[in-house]
């Protein structure tokens, strides 16, 4: 028997520095977690103790903090090289700055293979990107070889900016011939490493003949066997065993997100490449693991540029940006409108001639807007200003919801109106009218939404049985502020870009902003 240790991360999202337990900015260092310096300590410890170790990343290193905003992926290549990753799969967020924003900082600089079997380049891009990412890679590990085959969510064109010269194929259809190729090359230990979410990971384990292990990402799935060490609730045991259609027992793993855990899976193979046992658990990277001093010093060196950036002007406002709780928790506020407009703008993807865009709607809990921005400071808006407005380090995500769920959400928005509670919704691409004289749960008297399948966008009544795409904070997608109906009834959830980054990019693009209160949210006469 031959034993392989797979160390894995996924959805790190720019968390190069240690973070608090909820993966936001580290405040009390003695209780902070993760970060590449701490990760390196643990990886090195395992490499020293065990003979056959692979360190893999399942995508979405890009996007999530000011590190990515400033360094645009150069930081990913640099620190992943320093940690000596063995392979990485492309995630959807790796395309956030377009294909160029992937090629130059990461693909050309990485000293490890970057993989995806289901992304096919065409046109002029084909020769430009040739060899910079691969469908698979055969890695020597000790006296053996291990094949790693990559995959990426086929929804990437709706979630990021891969352009028109990359085709995202069905994962299973694309993976099978590559795995077959590895088999003909006498590679009998094959890991599928990719970024399509836990459901697809399980399908790959079930359907792709010859895959021995699946290491996934995208859905931030936390798996654990036994008592979990922190706040995350396991979605299943680690590893999660899937029985393939032909009867193989395939371990599937994922390691939550944000570099909080290091996935640790031990696989025992026989001489024929049969998996005869698998066990492990994610390792919580808490403060009991010291940060590696040399990596930490490097982080501090790279950090300097971030501090300078946060005080630089992004753009100007010529109006007061009203982000006060007195406004945003009671009525339409122009800060809410600005943020929602930025959220929609960030999700412009013209992928179908029938649609002007794939999504037109935004909702945002008023309680998530934490500060106004005064225009009487020469109109200057900085990252620092935006960090005061959006201090929680969340993301603006894409969900699919039925109209009936949206109606419930808007009823919840005003179910206890007047108490300055955070659930009051700010909107974009939505016109809502409330009648507060009616009983809670029956206060939405009009709800019109902006069409997407149209050449001239216009507002139509919400249809209860129709499925709509909506951009919203991850806080709401996870049921925050009492929006349990969103969490329980959402049909799809893809995590998006860092909230501050979305707004800062929009302001930089617009240069001068002047958001108004324009009648998106109304109260019917006599009730307000």
């Amino acid at each position: 028997a031959w034993e392989l240790t797979i160390l894995h991360t996924n959805d790190v999202h720019s968390r190069l520095e240690q973070t608090s337990e909820d993966s936001s900015k580290c405040v009390n260092a003695s209780r902070c977690m993760g970060g590449v310096a701490r990760l390196f300590t643990k990886v090195q410890q395992i490499r020293r103790a065990e003979p056959n170790v692979l360190l893999l990343d399942a995508g979405d290193q890009y996007q999530g903090t000011i590190w990515f905003t400033v360094y645009k992926g150069a930081e990913v290549a640099h620190f992943m090289n320093a940690l000596r990753y063995d392979a990485m799969a492309l995630g959807n967020h790796e395309f956030d700055n377009g294909v160029e924003g992937l090629i130059e900082p990461l693909l050309k600089e990485a000293k490890f293979p970057i993989l995806s079997a289901n992304i096919k380049a065409k046109g002029p891009l084909a020769s430009q990107i040739s060899g910079l990412y691969l469908p698979y890679k055969v890695l020597p590990v000790g006296d053996e070889v291990v094949g790693i085959v990559g995959y990426t969510s086929k929804e990437t064109p709706f979630l990021s900016n891969p352009g028109t010269n990359l085709v995202f194929e069905d994962e299973i259809t694309a993976l099978q011939p590559e795995v077959d190729k590895l088999k003909t090359l006498n590679v009998n230990k094959i890991i599928a490493l990719g970024h399509s979410g836990f459901e697809m990971d399980k399908l790959i384990a079930q359907k792709v003949r010859g895959v021995d292990v699946v290491v996934g990402g995208h859905s931030n799935t936390f798996l654990y066997t036994g008592n979990p060490p922190s706040k995350e609730v396991p979605a299943g045991k680690y590893p999660f065993i899937v029985t393939s259609d032909d009867g193989r027992k395939v371990p599937v793993v994922q390691a939550y997100a944000f570099g909080k855990y290091l996935g640790y899976l031990k696989i025992e193979f026989d001489e024929r490449g049969n998996v005869i046992s698998s066990h492990g658990n994610p390792i919580l990277l808490n403060s009991s693991i010291p940060e590696d001093p040399s990596i930490k010093a490097d982080i501090n060196k790279w950090r300097i540029k971030l501090d300078n950036y946060s005080t630089q002007e992004l753009g100007k406002t010529i109006v007061y940006l009203d982000g006060s709780s007195q406004s945003c928790r009671f009525r339409e506020c122009n800060m809410g409108n600005l943020i929602c407009d930025a959220m929609i703008n960030n999700n412009l993807r013209h992928t179908d001639e029938m649609f002007w865009n794939h999504v037109s709607m935004c909702i945002l809990n008023g309680g998530g807007i934490r500060s106004p921005i005064d225009e009487r400071n020469n109109g200057t808006i900085t990252w620092e200003n935006l960090a005061a407005v959006l201090p929680f380090g969340g993301t603006f995500d894409l969900v699919q919801l039925k109209g009936s769920t949206l109606k419930k959400a808007f009823e919840h928005s005003v179910h206890r109106y007047g108490q300055s509670t955070g659930e009051f919704l700010q909107v974009g691409g939505i016109h809502v009218v409330y009648d507060l004289s009616r009983k809670p749960g029956d206060r939405v008297v009009k709800l019109d939404v902006l069409c997407t399948k149209c050449r001239v966008p216009s507002y139509d009544p919400l249809k209860m049985d129709e499925v709509y795409k909506v951009i919203l904070p991850n806080f709401l997608a996870n049921g925050g502020d009492g929006f349990q109906m969103i969490k329980d009834e959402l049909l799809r959830h893809d995590s998006g870009d860092q909230d501050i980054n979305v707004v800062s990019t929009y302001i930089s693009k617009m240069k001068v902003i002047y958001p108004a209160v324009e009648g998106r949210i109304k109260f019917s006469t006599g009730s307000h």
Partner: antibody, heavy 119, light 107 residues
Framework: QVQLVQSGAEVKKPGASVKVSCKAS????????IQWVRQAPGQGLEWMGA????????RYTQKFQGRVTMTADTSISTAYMELSRLRSDDTAVYYC????????????WGQGTTVTVSS | DIQMTQSPSSLSASVGDRVTITCRAS??????LNWYQQKPGKAPKLLIH???RLHSGVPSRFSGSGSGTDYTLTISSLQPEDFATYYC?????????FGQGTKVEIK
């Protein structure tokens, strides 16, 4: 070395049941499927089904569904195949074999257990 | 279920002869084809897996080839100990199925 040792020959009456055992040694019993294959006198090989001792998952062919039960006792590394409602055409040599799941070949076989069904 | 058809059902050959046995599947089995040798009163023995890969300890005079639905077992120079019955088996789709066997007899 890796081996599978089966229980001895059985003579049964029609309508009765038979339970054949297969003891594994020399490898991780819970890591491989145990396949059951039978061979009627002068005939070819016929796959009946399989069990994965690691979680007692089973696969049976349509022909034997409802009549065959495969079990395993991991504490003694032994797999069992029970065939009920025996008929005379169930007279055969019953083999257990270890299945390799990369190609679904059977690389280690038991010596076979002869089951005779006769009134 | 996938049907496996072997030909010939039996053949007579002499020591030193080159012997070829074919196996046809009722559908594409993607090279998941295994060959076994069985001697009277004994359990089958694995010779070749995945069309052409020799199982450990099997002499190199045995070889396999084929793709799609048609596969071949070749014994380059028949030895006295090779007189036996040979079975093919597909490992592509459950239920696993065997060919009816080819008996190799002494001429």
């Amino acid at each position: 070395q890796v081996q599978l040792v089966q229980s001895g020959a059985e003579v049964k009456k029609p309508g009765a049941s038979v339970k054949v055992s297969c003891k594994a040694s020399g490898y991780t019993f819970t890591g491989y499927w145990i396949q059951w294959v039978r061979q009627a006198p002068g005939q070819g090989l016929e796959w009946m089904g399989a069990i994965y001792p690691g979680d007692e998952d089973t696969r049976y062919t349509q022909k034997f569904q409802g009549r065959v039960t495969m079990t395993a006792d991991t504490s003694i590394s032994t797999a069992y195949m029970e065939l009920s409602r025996l008929r005379s055409d169930d007279t055969a040599v019953y083999y257990c074999a270890r299945g390799n799941w990369d190609d679904w070949d059977f690389d280690v076989w038991g010596q076979g257990t002869t089951v005779t069904v006769s009134s | 279920d996938i049907q496996m058809t072997q030909s010939p059902s039996s053949l007579s050959a002499s020591v030193g002869d080159r012997v070829t046995i074919t196996c046809r599947a009722s559908q594409d089995i993607s090279n998941y084809l295994n060959w076994y040798q069985q001697k009277p009163g004994k359990a089958p023995k694995l010779l070749i897996h995945y069309t052409s890969r020799l199982h450990s300890g099997v002499p190199s005079r045995f070889s396999g080839s084929g793709s799609g639905t048609d596969y071949t077992l070749t014994i380059s120079s028949l030895q006295p100990e090779d007189f036996a019955t040979y079975y093919c088996q597909q490992g592509d789709t459950l239920p696993w199925t065997f060919g009816q066997g080819t008996k190799v007899e002494i001429k």
